[in-house]
């Protein structure tokens, strides 16, 4: 728990350099996100493909989309889960991180020092051991997060199933209902290829209790979709006299000394380009 209050931001006096004053874990071990670069990567043949069960959510069901002042969050049902880890990990929520229109490079994890445009996190908790995400969040092996790197490219109708509701959650505390859809559509191609490491929540309280799976391949959203994400939301309540745009809501990469990130793929990426045979 924070030593003193729960106010934190990505900018200004309560920005990430100050997080550890109120949230000691933010200055502690196993912090995320990190830069994924070749000299910390090690292939691990035991990293088998994950199975995504109960991810196809019925449109007859309503799911709560919330502006929590830090991101836009979609609540997920407890019968949605990942199979293939040591325990069952049940979904609790997904949210995104992004940059701003002038610098649209707001992913949390970087690859060889390069940011992607944005990043999706699908948060799960160890439901074999703990009754809910809140209880699990500060426990060993408590959380498992799937991270999807997002780049600018073609229009993505699946991501638009979230983005089309942003106007109803413009301000902190606002909530809207989203029809269920297949959450697996938000994942990239070849989900069997991923990075795996032990890390933390990337927001306060920064608990070092997360098993990270960062998919190797990015998904694409259009420039218009990215711009909508970067311009639609505010960190402040509707009646706040000093509104603050919700931009650059990503944490800087953290030091990652004397540890390894394991990959489910051997690192040679086969390139096929027009004109090459």
């Amino acid at each position: 728990a924070p030593v003193n209050g729960s106010k934190w931001t990505y900018f200004g006096p309560d920005g990430e350099n100050s997080w550890s004053k109120k949230y000691p874990s933010c200055g502690g071990l196993l912090q995320s996100p990190i830069d994924l670069h070749s000299d910390i990567l090690q292939y691990d043949a035991s990293l088998t493909p994950l199975e995504f069960q109960g991810y196809n959510l019925s449109a007859n069901k309503q799911f709560l989309l919330t502006n929590n002042g830090h991101s836009v969050k979609l609540n997920l049902p407890s019968d949605m889960h990942i199979q293939g880890l040591q325990s069952r990990y049940s979904a609790t929520q997904l949210h995104l991180h992004w940059g701003n229109p002038n610098d649209p490079h707001g992913s949390e994890h970087t690859v060889s020092g390069q940011h992607f445009a944005a990043e999706l996190h699908i948060v799960h908790y160890n439901s074999d051991l703990y009754p809910d995400a809140s209880t699990a969040s500060n426990k060993s092996e408590g959380l498992a997060v799937l991270a999807v790197l997002i780049e600018m490219g073609s229009f993505n109708p699946s991501y638009d199933k979230i983005f089309s509701h942003l106007q109803h959650v413009k301000y902190k505390g606002q909530e809207a209902f989203v029809p269920g859809f297949n959450i697996e559509e938000l994942l990239p191609e070849r989900t069997a290829e991923y990075y795996r490491y032990r890390g933390s929540l990337t927001t306060p309280p920064c608990n070092p209790t997360v098993l990270w799976t960062v998919f190797r391949n990015p998904v694409q959203i259009s420039q218009e979709q990215l711009l909508a994400l970067e311009t639609a939301l505010y960190c402040t309540h509707m009646d706040d006299p000093s509104p603050r745009e919700m931009i650059n809501n990503f944490r800087q990469v953290q030091k990652f000394d004397e540890r390894l990130v394991y990959t489910s793929f051997s690192q040679v990426q086969v390139c096929t380009a027009a004109g090459l045979s």
Partner: antibody, heavy 121, light 106 residues
Framework: EVQLVESGGGLVQPGGSLRLSCAAS????????IYWVRQAPGKGLEWVGY????????TYNQKFKGRATISVDKSKNTAYLQMNSLRAEDTAVYYC??????????????WGQGTLVTVSS | DIQMTQSPSSLSASVGDRVTITCRAS?????MHWYQQKPGKAPKPWIY???MLASGVPSRFSGSGSGTDFTLTISSLQPEDFATYYC?????????FGQGTKVEIK
């Protein structure tokens, strides 16, 4: 025929609690959420909360958070609304209802007949 | 919360009259739904998705609007139309209903 039937209403003392039932039939029970909506005498409709019968996940109107608890018994195709610390203003007809998705939105296509709860000493 | 204000709260009209009920939302909503309720009965779905008539609803009913202003119109009032009509939005949590418009016989 799709049906929702509420029961459990009656006279309750102020400060007391109620437990209402909503029995569903005629459709695949876990495919739709069940909502509770109430209507005070001569007043409008007010949403209390809902439950996903497939997993028991609940969402409440903030106004009722902490005082209302919705639960489900899948084996009986029945949802329950428990409300505590009742006051006179909780006197209402309580309905359960089922929303259906139609292309781009939901609407309540099936309603129960309602059950009257009177809070009075 | 999105407040839904219906006007008028009640109206008296004669059979054959054209009747318009307005629902104004305090913030923009995507769709509006309408329910009909008769005394001692549960509400019935009447118009959904702003303009779609529910099963069995006569074609003299219509719905329209966008943003914050929506209307339910009865082109020629019939005896069976005397009831209370409620609008409802599902765009924001909590979902909210209007306070109702009671259509009475003049």
């Amino acid at each position: 025929e799709v049906q929702l039937v509420e029961s459990g209403g009656g006279l309750v003392q102020p400060g007391g609690s109620l437990r209402l039932s909503c029995a569903a039939s005629g459709y695949s029970y876990t495919d739709y959420n069940i909502y509770w909506v109430r209507q005070a005498p001569g007043k409008g409709l007010e949403w209390v909360g809902y439950i996903d019968p497939a997993n028991g996940d609940t969402t409440y109107n903030q106004k009722f958070k902490g005082r209302a608890t919705i639960s489900v018994d899948k084996s009986k195709n029945t949802a329950y609304l428990q409300m505590n610390s009742l006051r006179a203003e909780d006197t209402a007809v309580y309905y359960c209802s089922r929303p259906i998705y139609y292309g781009a939105y939901w609407y309540f296509d099936v309603w129960g007949q309602g059950t009257l709860v009177t809070v009075s000493s | 919360d999105i407040q839904m204000t219906q006007s008028p709260s009640s109206l008296s009209a004669s059979v054959g009259d054209r009747v318009t009920i307005t629902c104004r939302a305090s913030s923009s909503v995507t769709y509006m739904h309408w329910y009909q309720q008769k005394p001692g009965k549960a509400p019935k779905p009447w118009i959904y998705g702003t303009s779609m008539l529910a099963s069995g609803v006569p074609s003299r009913f219509s719905g329209s609007g966008s943003g914050t202003d929506f209307t339910l119109t009865i082109s020629s009032l019939q005896p069976e139309d005397f009831a209370t009509y409620y609008c409802q939005q599902w765009s924001s949590n909590p979902l909210t209903f209007g306070q109702g418009t009671k259509v009475e016989i003049k």
